[in-house]
Amino acid sequence: QEEDLPRPSISAEPGTVIPLGSHVTFVCRGPVGVQTFRLERDSRSTYNDTEDVSQASPSESEARFRIDSVREGNAGLYRCIYYKPPKWSEQSDYLELLVKESSGGPDSPDTEPGSSAGPTQRPSDNSHNEHAPASQGLKAEHLY
C-alpha cells in the first residue's frame, strides 16, 4: 500500500516582499526520499524542476529555487509539489511574492522576515489546478 504523502511547504528567503533587482530564494520542503521538487506559478505556464534535493533535518528534505534579480514579472503566487516514487504529492499552499520599488531609505527594511505562513500564504485549489507553472533547481529566472 502506498504511503500518504504530506503536503509540501513553501517559504521565501529573505522574505515575501522583495525590492526590484534584489534576490529571492523559494524553499520547498517535503519528507525525506523526495526525488524531484517542482515550483509552480499561478496563471503562468512555465515551470522548472530540480533534483538537487538536500536533507534539511532527519525527517525533512528541501530544494531551493533562486531568482538572482527580481523583476516586476516575478510578482505573483508560487507553490511547490514534489515527486517521491512512485507518486506526486499534493501541492503546497500558494505563497505570494510582492515586488516593490527600491526605496533605499534607512528606516524602511528591504524585506519582510522569511516566512511560510501569514497573509502571503494562500490555499491552493488541489481539486483541479495541479498544473500551474513552475521553476528550476538552481535558478528560477524564467518563471515570469
Partner: antibody
Amino acid sequence: SVKESGGRLVTPGTPLTLTCTASGFSLYKYNIQWVRQAPGKGLEYIGASTYAGYTYYASWAKGRVTISRTSTTVDLKMTSPTTEDTATYFCARHIDGDYSGYALWGPGTLVTISS
Amino acid sequence: ELVLTQTPASVSAAVGGTVTIKCQASQSIGTWFAWYQQKPGQSPKLLIYGPSKLASGVPPRFKGSGSGTEFTLTISDLECADAATYYCQSTYFGVDYLGGTFGGGTEVVVK
C-alpha cells in the same frame, strides 16, 4: 520519443485501446495529451493525463473514452466507438519547462470504425 | 467550454511576403497557448509556445505574440516550405478547468 500503437479496423461498438509509449525520458514528469484528426479535418483535442496523475477530457469525450497511465505508457480506451471516431490518433508530450506547448508528437495510429 | 476562434481559414501570400494569423479565446488563458504547423501526412510540429517563445529549431521568421484572449502568429519572409496548415491550441488546466482546445486551422498557401 513517444509512439502510438493499437490502431486498427474494428466494428462499431467494439472497445479499442490505444497505447502511447514513452522512451528516452521519465514519463512521471510530463503531461501527455491525446489528439485526433479525422481524414481531411482539423486537430481535435481528446484529453490529457497530467504528470501529477490527474486526467482531463474534452466535453465531447467524457464517457466515451478513458485515459490511464503507467510508468511508461498512457492508454486511451475507446469504450464504444462509432464511425465518427475514425481518425488518426496522436499522443504528445509537453515541452520541458513549459506546460503550454507539446513538442514531442508520435507519428499517429490510424483507427477505422466500420461495419 | 473554451473556444478558440482562428482567422482566417485560408490565406495566400507570395514568397518573401508576410502572413498574419489570429486566434481569439473565449476566456482568458494567460500564457497557456501554442501554435503548431502541420503538413499533409505528418504529425503537428510545435512552433511557438508560452505564447511568444520559439520552439527549438524554428526560425525567427515565426513570431508569436499576445496574452489573455488575443494571440497572433506572424510569418515573415515566407518560403515555399511554410505552406502548411497552422493551428492554435490552449492547454490551460486551471481552477476553472478550460482544458485543451484547438482552433479550426489556417491553411497557408505560398505562391
